[in-house]
């Protein structure tokens, strides 16, 4: 038997992926566990193998179909179970009735690139990945810039309250190395959360022209 507190958290990426994390204090170390998804109104069901991400937590991705296919809607309810092998049987360790559009977390933005860089400013663009057509252009973004000598946690957050897949960073220091990240969130869903941060994009501002006031 497994004692201790258990936490089972899942998010829908709005298209064809449900990502889950299961945490269990005092969990069995060498037991095979999986997440099973059983929708209430679809003909498919899906399973993924839970893999350790730390000493007491496991994660897996339920792939429901092609990345850009719309596999679930607001009326779907998916029963999600954590099943762990006990001898020849499977034991239910956690269960939840999952409402996908109340528990959204989009994929991190991709394809970050520097469009134009100057001494004091830099224009950066990105793309969103696997976001439902239901949202149309109604998404919000947060961005942050890592300056020399600072940490990501210290970086001020810039908020974009519309689907704007670019930003012009101003008041930068010439000839300086920076890093930039962005994340995205839809408006819908009581338990919806920000996407993971994008991979950081490194860029360097241009040096100030010699003999000029900067």
């Amino acid at each position: 038997a497994v004692n201790g507190t258990s936490q089972f958290t899942c998010f829908y990426n709005s298209r064809a992926n449900i990502s889950c994390v299961w945490s269990q204090d005092g969990a069995l170390q060498d037991t095979s566990c999986q997440v099973h998804a059983w929708p209430d109104r679809r003909r498919w069901n899906q399973t993924c193998e839970l893999l350790p991400v730390s000493q007491a937590s496991w994660a897996c991705n339920l792939i429901l179909g092609a990345p850009d296919s719309q596999k679930l809607t607001t009326v779907d309810i998916v029963t999600l179970r954590v099943l762990c092998r006990e001898g020849v049987r499977w034991r239910v360790m956690a269960i939840q009735d999952f409402k996908p559009f109340e528990n959204l977390r989009l994929m991190a933005p991709i394809s970050l690139q520097v469009v134009h860089v100057e001494t004091h400013r830099c224009n950066i663009s990105w793309e969103i990945s696997q976001a439902s057509h239901y949202f149309e252009r109604h998404l919000e973004f947060e961005a942050r810039t890592l300056s020399p000598g600072h940490t990501w946690e210290e970086a001020p957050l810039l908020t974009l309250k519309q689907k704007q897949e670019w930003i012009c960073l101003e008041t930068l220091t010439p000839d300086t190395q920076y890093e930039f990240q962005v994340r995205v969130k839809p408006l819908q869903g009581e338990f919806t959360t920000w996407s993971p941060w994008s991979q950081p994009l490194a860029f360097r501002t241009k040096p100030a022209a010699l003999g000029k006031d900067t």
Epitope: R41, T73, T74, V75, D76, H138, P186, Q188
Partner: nanobody, 119 residues
Framework: EVQLVESGGGLVQTGGSLRLSCAVS????????MGWYRQVPGKQRELVAD???????KYADSVKGRFSILRDSVKNTVYLQMSSLKPEDTGIYYC?????????????WGQGTQVTVSS
């Protein structure tokens, strides 16, 4: 302003058929589910049938095999083909549409159409 306009209700004898239709119009929206609910006096509105994106239909047990739902996503219209009607199918039939407007999802209802099955 979103509008749901129902039609097709009426009086029919036991064993007869009716076809209800409901058209959604108005401001810019994306529909992900459309369906029909029934209300009889003194009772809660209950699901008769609905259809979500991906062709996933859901029916009340009492109508399975007798009613069929059809959704035309291009015309934003849903139909309920009712056959082998029984007196217990009598009630007000309401159309419901789940609509995405400006990035948020809400449910919208029609005014209802009366279906009466006489014995």
């Amino acid at each position: 302003e979103v509008q749901l306009v129902e039609s097709g209700g009426g009086l029919v004898q036991t064993g007869g058929s009716l076809r209800l239709s409901c058209a959604v119009s108005g401001s810019r929206f994306i529909s992900d589910v459309m369906g029909w609910y029934r209300q009889v006096p003194g009772k809660q509105r209950e699901l008769v049938a609905d259809m979500a994106d991906g062709g996933s239909a859901k029916y009340a047990d009492s109508v399975k095999g007798r009613f069929s739902i059809l959704r035309d996503s291009v015309k934003n219209t849903v139909y309920l083909q009712m056959s082998s009607l029984k007196p217990e199918d009598t009630g007000i039939y309401y159309c419901k549409a789940g609509l995405w407007i400006a990035g948020r999802h809400s449910d919208y209802w029609g005014q209802g159409t009366q279906v009466t099955v006489s014995s």
